[in-house]
Amino acid sequence: LIQERRSHQNNPAAHLTGANSSLTGSGGPLLWETQLGLAFLRGLDYHDGALVANKAGYYYIYSKVQLGGVGCPLGLASTITHGLYKRTPRYPEELELLVSQQSPCGRATSNSRVWWDSSFLGGVVHLEVGEEVVVRVLDERLVRLRDGTRSYFGAFMV
Amino acid sequence: LIQERRSHQNNPAAHLTGANSSLTGSGGPLLWETQLGLAFLRGLDYHDGALVANKAGYYYIYSKVQLGGVGCPLGLASTITHGLYKRTPRYPEELELLVSQQSPCGRATSNSRVWWDSSFLGGVVHLEVGEEVVVRVLDERLVRLRDGTRSYFGAFMV
Amino acid sequence: LIQERRSHQNNPAAHLTGANSSLTGSGGPLLWETQLGLAFLRGLDYHDGALVANKAGYYYIYSKVQLGGVGCPLGLASTITHGLYKRTPRYPEELELLVSQQSPCGRATSNSRVWWDSSFLGGVVHLEVGEEVVVRVLDERLVRLRDGTRSYFGAFMV
């Protein structure tokens, strides 16, 4: 039982939450709260929006983003892409891990209609020590932040 | 290997399923089947809709609800809120953990159109012994139950 | 620590990815890439679209499918069903485990409008040795495959 408890206490896990500073508008990944509220890091590090692996292995990574808007810009059902991406020293470009595309504002049948949608991603990926995972949303202007419960990003070793 | 198997057998986990009695209409949380069919409890308790932690630690908690209806009431794209909430004796009001807002019936462009949508939530949260997690849906009248496979609620320690 | 690492290295886990060959049109389950790219099998087997348990226990199983299309066939908001199903020698028919129904193309208000939607399922189920889990989508013609990041299927023991 001591062994089992120790195993859980050491198992890498993290849950990061959305904050007003999450959306940078700079074309970079979303940034996250790592310590206060519901957020925590256990055996994983954080750097500029990225969860960083301290231990090699398979991780279940997940992210949810809350989307919302009023009507459809230019009457178009714009496509929103929400994805989890890996950064690794061996490759200069980020690698797509898990991605979703949605056309949520097509739900609003007039330009003044408020709409909400949510996108959830989760899956198991392998991370080496030092490899990073980030969340990107295109177009991030449609991400609706409030209090850390609607948009978030996490992982745990499996 | 014996150690490893024992560890898994003792790891708290649960999966609860929707049933006709899930929707109470009382303003309370959804209620769940805990034993029949796909439902089970292992190292977690259940009380009035809530999963109750018997062991302190970080848990991946999740819920899915199946939504559906015919047309949009009053032609409005009503917002549905699906959330996981924590109850703890010190704080009588539930604490939001993971929440989604959706406007699914905006998908139906006429009042006679049948629509379906699904909302999934999952994330890692900390629970102390005796703390409870419940699921709420507003408006719960749009939750469509059938056989325990479309709406459910679960957790496991990570 | 050795014990803890061994436990993780042996813990059954898998992540399978969508490929051009995933959609058979034969009425069978989706097929998956098991080795290339992001796909892997660790302590689970694969057979004709199915993840096969080598070790009895509770597994968190998950699947995401990327849906997309142009307009709504016949102007109808067609219902898409995405589900995880269990095959077991004891029963001739597949058992529903986790299922979602969605009406995504209702988002497009004209017949020429492109729409995208995503469906995610995840939950804990019990598998005996030799039992299989498959993914089905009806109508699978609306599944949009690309590079293994948008439609996938996985599991790990909890």
Partner: antibody, heavy 117, light 110 residues
């Protein structure tokens, strides 16, 4: 129940250091941040910093940066706040407080530190 | 991080209602529903009275209520009693793992 018990009052000379302890009970010590807040006589509450008890990460108020060090001993469920280079204006009651979500609850009973030559 | 702005003092007679304001910015009070209020009697540790803008912990009288509008949060105490005389502090999450206290308000029950 959840409780924080702090060490007793201290009298220090200017230039010295003081280390105040805060022993936690009734909850999982490693799963919450611990904050330190001080209050000089007749003055307002002043946030000094926090420690993530689980991983040891710290964040300090700019005002105290370089003079304050917050540590913890997980085996003893105890957090510590050490303030160096003491001056007379550091005379205050020092409180530890558990971070629960986005508020402080509970608080320790306080430790009076008097800096006097 | 500059302190949230509170009035230095407020007063009221027993049975009356009083309101204490707490003004911040869109980066703290206005940006999140994460305002809490603490009561501190002389020589005692602060006590949580309100969390998440308007919620009361168990054991706190329902005479205490909280609200928020824009960048200003408010604590209202109805049916003032002698034992309510104390200092009151607001507190807010301010993003990026930072927090900020108010300057404190001394409540006098006349």
């Amino acid at each position: 129940q959840v409780q924080l018990v702090q060490s007793g009052a201290e009298v220090k000379k200017p230039g010295a250091s003081v280390k105040v302890s805060c022993r936690a009970s009734g909850y999982t010590f490693t799963s919450y941040l611990m904050h330190w807040v001080r209050q000089a006589p007749g003055q307002r509450l002043e946030w000094m910093g926090w420690i993530n008890v689980g991983n040891g990460n710290t964040k300090y108020s700019q005002k105290f940066q370089g003079r304050v060090t917050i540590t913890r001993d997980t085996s003893a469920s105890t957090a510590y706040m050490e303030l160096s280079g003491l001056r007379s204006e550091d005379t205050a009651v020092y409180y530890c407080a558990r971070n629960y979500y986005n508020w402080f609850d509970p608080w320790g009973q306080g430790t009076l530190v008097t800096v006097s030559s | 991080q500059s302190a949230l702005t509170q009035p230095a003092s407020v007063s009221g007679s027993p049975g009356q209602s009083i309101t204490i304001s707490c003004t911040g910015t869109s980066s703290d009070v206005g940006g999140y529903n994460y305002v809490s209020w603490y009561q501190q009697h002389p020589g005692k540790a602060p006590k949580l009275m309100i969390y998440d803008v308007s919620k009361r912990p168990s054991g706190v009288s329902n005479r205490f209520s909280g609200s928020k509008s824009g960048n200003t949060a408010s604590l209202t105490i109805s049916g003032l009693q002698a034992e309510d005389e104390a200092d009151y502090y607001c507190f807010s999450y301010a993003g990026s793992s930072t927090v900020v206290f108010g300057g404190g308000t001394k409540l006098t029950v006349l």
